[in-house]
C-alpha cells in the first residue's frame, strides 16, 4: 500500500502507474467501491458522480500518455483521510491518504509574553512526530500539541512545522504576529527647558487596529503615579480622550504613537509606562519610558549641576571649565564647585566616557551675574 501525506486545504496527488507507459483504461474508487473518476478508452475524463460532489477530484490528462494516472484531490479535508483504489490493467493498487492539519491556538496575533500552542490534527491510526522551528531558529518537538511560553518579539514571523510519518514528511508554515512595541524601554536625556519627545513605535503592522491606551507617570519627586494622557486608536488614527493640565502633553494624531512635552522640568523627571489595550485581545502592550533632566545653576559663589530622574549608579556627573580637565566628577546626582573661575562651564552626564547630556553655563567675573546660553 502506498502512503501519501497531505495538508488540509491544499492538494494531494495519489499515484497510479501503468507498466506499459502508455494511455490505458483506469478507474479510481473509494474503498467502498464507489467510483470517483476514470478514463474508459476515449481519452475523456469521466467523473463518478454529480459535479458538486466530485469537483475537488481531478487527474492529470497530460500525464496519461506517459502511463501515469494520478488522482488529484484539491482543497483537502480531514475526512479525505482514507484508502483509495486505482484499477488498471486487471490489477488494483491501494493508496492510503493521510491528511494533517497544524493550527495555532485561537489566534495567530498574540501579545508579547503570551503562550503559543501549536496543535496537530491527524487521522486515526497515524502516529506522526512533529517538530516546529521558530523564526529565530529555535526547535521544539513533541506530540500532538507543542507549546511555547513567554513569546518574544523575535518569535514574530513564519513558524515551520514538519510532520513525519513512515519516513514521509509534510511541512506547514504558520505566520505568527507578536504584538509588541519595538522597544520595551527607552530613556530620554534633556536639559531643563528643552522640548521632550516620546515615541512608541509598534513592532507590527495590522490593517485594522483598534484599542485604547494610557500613559501613567511616576515623577521622581512625587509620592504616587499620575495618569498623564488617555487616548483611543482606530486603524492609524489616534484621538486624545483626556490629558492633564500640567504637563500639557500633545499627542500625534496618527501612528506611530508620539507624545510631546513642551519642556523638560525637574518635576517631570521620572518614569512612565504607556499601556495599549487592543480590541479583542486579553492583556496589554507595555513600553516604559524614562526622563532624565539636567539643570546647571550659579547661586552666589556656588556653581551647581543636578540631574533628576532614573540614572544608573555607573553614570558620572562632571563639572569642567571648557577645554580643561574636570574640576569635579562624581557618581552622584549633584555636583558643585565653590568660587568658580570665570568662563564657560560644562556640566556633563556620561556613561563610560560617552556624553549623554550636556549643559553649559557662563560664569562671569564676580561683579557680574551669570549668563545661561
Amino acid at each position: 500500500k502506498t502512503l501519501v501525506l497531505g495538508k488540509e486545504g491544499e492538494s494531494a496527488e495519489l499515484p497510479c502507474e501503468s507498466s506499459q507507459k502508455k494511455i490505458t483504461v483506469f478507474t479510481w474508487k473509494f474503498s467502498d467501491q464507489r467510483k470517483i473518476l476514470g478514463q474508459h478508452g476515449k481519452g475523456v475524463l469521466i467523473r463518478g458522480g454529480s459535479p458538486s460532489q466530485f469537483d475537488r477530484f481531478d487527474s492529470k490528462k497530460g500525464a496519461w500518455e506517459k502511463g501515469s494516472f494520478p488522482l488529484i484531490i484539491n482543497k483537502l479535508k480531514m475526512e479525505d483521510s482514507q484508502t483509495y483504489i486505482c484499477e488498471l490493467e486487471n490489477r488494483k493498487e491501494e493508496v492510503e491518504l493521510w491528511v494533517f492539519k497544524v493550527t495555532a491556538n485561537s489566534d495567530t496575533h498574540l501579545l508579547q509574553g503570551q503562550s503559543l500552542t501549536l496543535t496537530l490534527e491527524s487521522p486515526p491510526g497515524s502516529s506522526p512526530s512533529v517538530q516546529c522551528r521558530s523564526p529565530r531558529g529555535k526547535n521544539i518537538q513533541g506530540g500532538k500539541t507543542l507549546s511555547v511560553s513567554q513569546l518574544e518579539l523575535q518569535d514574530s514571523g513564519t513558524w515551520t512545522c514538519t510532520v513525519l510519518q513512515n519516513q514521509k514528511k509534510v511541512e506547514f508554515k504558520i505566520d505568527i504576529v507578536v504584538l509588541a512595541f519595538q522597544k520595551a524601554s527607552s530613556i530620554v536625556y534633556k536639559k531643563e527647558g528643552e522640548q521632550v519627545e516620546f515615541s512608541f513605535p509598534l513592532a507590527f503592522t495590522v490593517e485594522k487596529l483598534t484599542g485604547s491606551g494610557e500613559l501613567w507617570w511616576q515623577a521622581e519627586r512625587a509620592s504616587s503615579s499620575k495618569s498623564w494622557i488617555t487616548f483611543d486608536l482606530k486603524n492609524k488614527e489616534v484621538s486624545v480622550k483626556r490629558v492633564t493640565q500640567d504637563p500639557k502633553l500633545q499627542m500625534g494624531k496618527k501612528l506611530p504613537l508620539h507624545l510631546t512635552l513642551p519642556q523638560a522640568l525637574p518635576q517631570y523627571a521620572g518614569s512612565g509606562n504607556l499601556t495599549l489595550a487592543l480590541e479583542a485581545k486579553t492583556g496589554k502592550l507595555h513600553q516604559e519610558v524614562n526622563l532624565v533632566v539636567m539643570r546647571a545653576t550659579q547661586l552666589q559663589k556656588n556653581l551647581t549641576c543636578e540631574v533628576w530622574g532614573p540614572t544608573s549608579p555607573k553614570l558620572m556627573l562632571s563639572l569642567k571649565l571648557e577645554n580643561k580637565e574636570a574640576k569635579v566628577s562624581k557618581r552622584e546626582k549633584a555636583v558643585w564647585v565653590l568660587n568658580p573661575e570665570a568662563g564657560m562651564w560644562q556640566c556633563l552626564l556620561s556613561d563610560s566616557g560617552q556624553v549623554l547630556l550636556e549643559s553649559n553655563i557662563k560664569v562671569l567675573p564676580t561683579w557680574s551675574t551669570p549668563v545661561q546660553p
Epitope: 483611543d232 500625534g252 494624531k253 496618527k254 510631546t260
Partner: antibody, heavy 118, light 107 residues
C-alpha cells in the same frame, strides 16, 4: 474619480447662520476624515474643522469653537458645516477636503463663498 | 496650538532658478508635514506628504525635506507653471495649522 462639491455659500448678516454642504463621490466616504478649510480674501489658508469617518470625533479651530459645528451623513456621502453667530472675519471661500489613508488632505473641492456683511 | 512660520513670505525668481521655501514649527512635529500649491482662484493642490513624499503626478523637480521643527520645499528648476503660492501644513495634531504662505512671483 474622487470629487467634492461644496454648496450653501452666500451673503449673510453678522450674527446670522448658514449651513454649508459638501457632496462627495468616487470613494468610500465613511472611511475618511473630512475637513473644512477657509481662505479670507487675499489671505492664506485657515483650517476650520475636521471630522473622523471611523470614530465620528470632531475637531474645531479655536476661532470657530462654539459657533461652527461639523457633521456628516455617511448614507448621503455628504459633509456639513453649520455656522452660526457669524462675524465679518468669517468672510471667506470655504473648501471641503478629504484626507487620504495617511491623514493628509489630498483632494479639495472648488470652494463656496461666504460673505458676512450688513 | 502649534505655530507654523513660513519664509520668505514672497520671492521673485526666473524660470530655471532653484527655489527654496522653509517652514518652522513651534514644536517638534516629527515628519507630519504637508506642502500645498495654490494658484489664484483655484483650490490648493497637494504636493508632498510626510515632509518628503512626493504625491503621484507631481513633477520630480519638487522635493521636500526636514524632521522635527525645520522643513524645506525645494523646486530644483522653476517652470512657468510653478508660479503660485505655497503653503506648509502641520498634520501632527489638532488644531491643524498652515504656514502663512510663500508667493513665488516672476522676476
Amino acid at each position: 474619480e474622487v470629487q467634492l462639491l461644496e454648496s450653501g455659500g452666500g451673503l449673510v448678516q453678522p450674527g446670522g447662520s448658514l449651513r454649508l454642504s459638501c457632496s462627495a463621490s468616487g470613494f468610500t466616504f465613511s472611511d475618511y476624515v473630512m475637513s473644512w478649510v477657509r481662505q479670507a480674501p487675499g489671505k492664506g489658508l485657515d483650517w476650520v474643522s475636521s471630522i473622523s469617518g471611523l470614530t465620528g470625533n470632531t475637531y474645531h479651530a479655536d476661532s470657530v469653537k462654539g459657533r461652527f459645528t461639523i457633521s456628516r451623513d455617511n448614507s448621503k456621502n455628504t459633509l456639513y458645516l453649520q455656522m452660526s453667530s457669524l462675524r465679518d472675519e468669517d468672510t471667506a471661500v470655504y473648501y471641503c477636503a478629504k484626507d487620504n489613508e495617511d491623514y493628509y488632505m489630498d483632494v479639495w473641492g472648488k470652494g463656496t463663498t461666504v460673505t458676512v456683511s450688513s | 496650538a502649534i505655530q507654523m512660520t513660513q519664509s520668505p513670505s514672497s520671492l521673485s525668481a526666473s524660470v530655471g532658478d532653484r527655489v527654496t521655501i522653509t517652514c518652522r514649527a513651534s514644536q517638534g512635529i516629527r515628519n507630519d508635514l504637508g506642502w500645498y500649491q495654490q494658484k489664484p482662484g483655484k483650490a490648493p493642490k497637494f504636493l508632498i506628504s510626510a515632509a518628503s513624499s512626493l504625491q503621484s503626478g507631481v513633477p520630480s523637480r519638487f522635493s521636500g525635506s526636514g524632521y522635527g521643527t525645520d522643513f524645506t520645499l525645494t523646486i530644483s528648476s522653476l517652470q512657468p507653471e510653478d508660479f503660485a503660492t505655497y503653503y506648509c501644513l502641520q498634520d501632527y495634531t489638532y488644531p491643524r495649522t498652515f504656514g502663512q504662505g510663500t508667493k513665488v512671483e516672476i522676476k
